[in-house]
């Protein structure tokens, strides 16, 4: 006996109560593949989640976070509070980065400034809460008599 359900396309389900007729998915449900015996309820973007893509009969809704929050987890399953650059999120909210650390994003943790001396270089631009240090040439390259710049190209 041929399984008539395999003929039911995405967006429908095989209705056993109606002699395996392909019935459209009810409102607020979807089937993303053919041959399904039920349609799945759509994901609801509620609360801190906002709808990025509406549910259709063939695809689930996709959620995003409201302004001031960013997505975490698979399929944006959580929303984490944004902080300013130069801050990190703690249990008590957004806190400024400690001296010697920086964060150039609205999310994530404060990271230590680069230690230029580990690469034998010197600090060209000091770090801030929002920016890492910029490492320059090694101190030896900056000693008197050493050329610290590329000589100009000869005039034509």
């Amino acid at each position: 006996l041929q399984d008539l359900c395999s003929n039911c396309p995405a967006g429908t389900f095989c209705d056993n109560n109606r002699s395996q007729i392909c019935s459209p998915c009810p409102p607020n449900s979807f089937s993303s593949a053919g041959g399904q015996r039920t349609c799945d309820i759509c994901r609801q973007c509620k609360g801190v989640f906002k709808t990025r893509k509406e549910c259709s009969s063939t695809s689930n809704a996709e959620c995003d976070c409201i302004s001031g929050y960013h997505c975490l987890g698979a399929e944006c399953s959580m929303c984490e509070q944004d902080c300013k650059q130069g801050q990190e999120l703690t249990k008590k909210g957004c806190k400024d980065c400690c001296f010697g650390t920086f964060n150039d994003q609205k999310r994530g943790i404060c990271r230590p400034w680069t230690n230029c001396s580990l690469d034998g270089k010197s600090v060209l631009v000091n770090g801030t809460k929002e920016r890492d240090v910029v490492c320059g040439p090694s101190p030896a390259d900056l000693s008197p008599g050493a050329s610290s710049a590329t000589p100009p190209a000869p005039a034509r």
Epitope: D40, G47, E80, Q81
Partner: antibody, heavy 123, light 106 residues
């Protein structure tokens, strides 16, 4: 520190109505991202979600109880309310107020709960 | 509505035992699943959210796993204070709870 304190429970006649309150402290009901709801538990039974209201006044109700429930809030008092009409014996339960999400990560779970208020529907 | 079915409904275990509770959803709710612990006369306490994230302050002997329709709460070494009722909860579409699993002393 986040705190939720429910009140308004007691003995109610069948067919009557009740209005429960939940006083929130340690956070504002109108803070962006915050949702607070009601969950009940009949004696010796499991948990049943009833309703939730968002910071921006979006309301969500349990489909099976939607016609009898009204959730609301008063931002000036930082207080949440639940009105339940046409009460029946099976509405006898402890009613909990709960806040969605955790401290800095928000999602569809409840990290903060009140101590609950007992509602008894009986003649 | 999305239904959540917990198994077993109750179990008896001893201190030090490894305990596993399962929660099956009527359709995929991944990863919008949380676990709670409730003791008599007390409000539920959040243990796990997002299927596997441990709530702050919850002992590391509690862990959550699973995806799609099948989820598990594991207590690696049962302690005296862990005897309680445990509930799963989905937040994928509205909110629903499982019927609960009572963990009793053997």
């Amino acid at each position: 520190e986040v705190q939720l304190v429910e009140s308004g429970g007691g003995l109610v006649q069948p067919g009557g109505s009740l209005r429960l309150s939940c006083a929130a402290s340690g956070f504002s009901l109108s803070t962006s991202g915050v949702g607070v709801g009601w969950i009940r538990q009949a004696p010796g039974k499991g948990l049943e979600w009833l309703a939730l209201i968002d910071w921006d006044d979006d309301k969500y109700y349990s489909p099976s109880l939607k016609s009898r429930l009204t959730i609301s809030r008063d931002n000036s008092k930082n207080t949440l309310y639940l009105q339940l009409n046409s009460l029946r014996a099976e509405d006898t339960a402890v009613y909990y107020c709960a806040r969605g999400g955790s401290d800095t990560v928000l999602g569809d779970w409840f990290a903060y709960w009140g101590q609950g208020t007992l509602v008894t529907v009986s003649s | 509505d999305i239904q959540l079915t917990q198994s077993p409904s109750s179990l008896s275990a001893s201190v030090g035992d490894r305990v596993t509770i399962t929660c099956r959803a009527s359709q995929s709710v991944s990863p919008y699943l949380a676990w709670y612990q409730q003791k008599p006369g007390k409000a539920p306490k959040l243990l796990i959210y997002d299927a596997s994230s441990l709530e702050s302050g919850v002992p590391s002997r509690f862990s959550g796993s699973g995806s799609g329709t099948d989820f598990t709460l594991t207590i690696s070494s049962l302690q005296p204070e862990d005897f309680a009722t445990y509930y799963c909860q989905q937040g994928y579409s509205l909110w629903t709870f499982g019927q609960g699993t009572k963990v009793e002393i053997k």
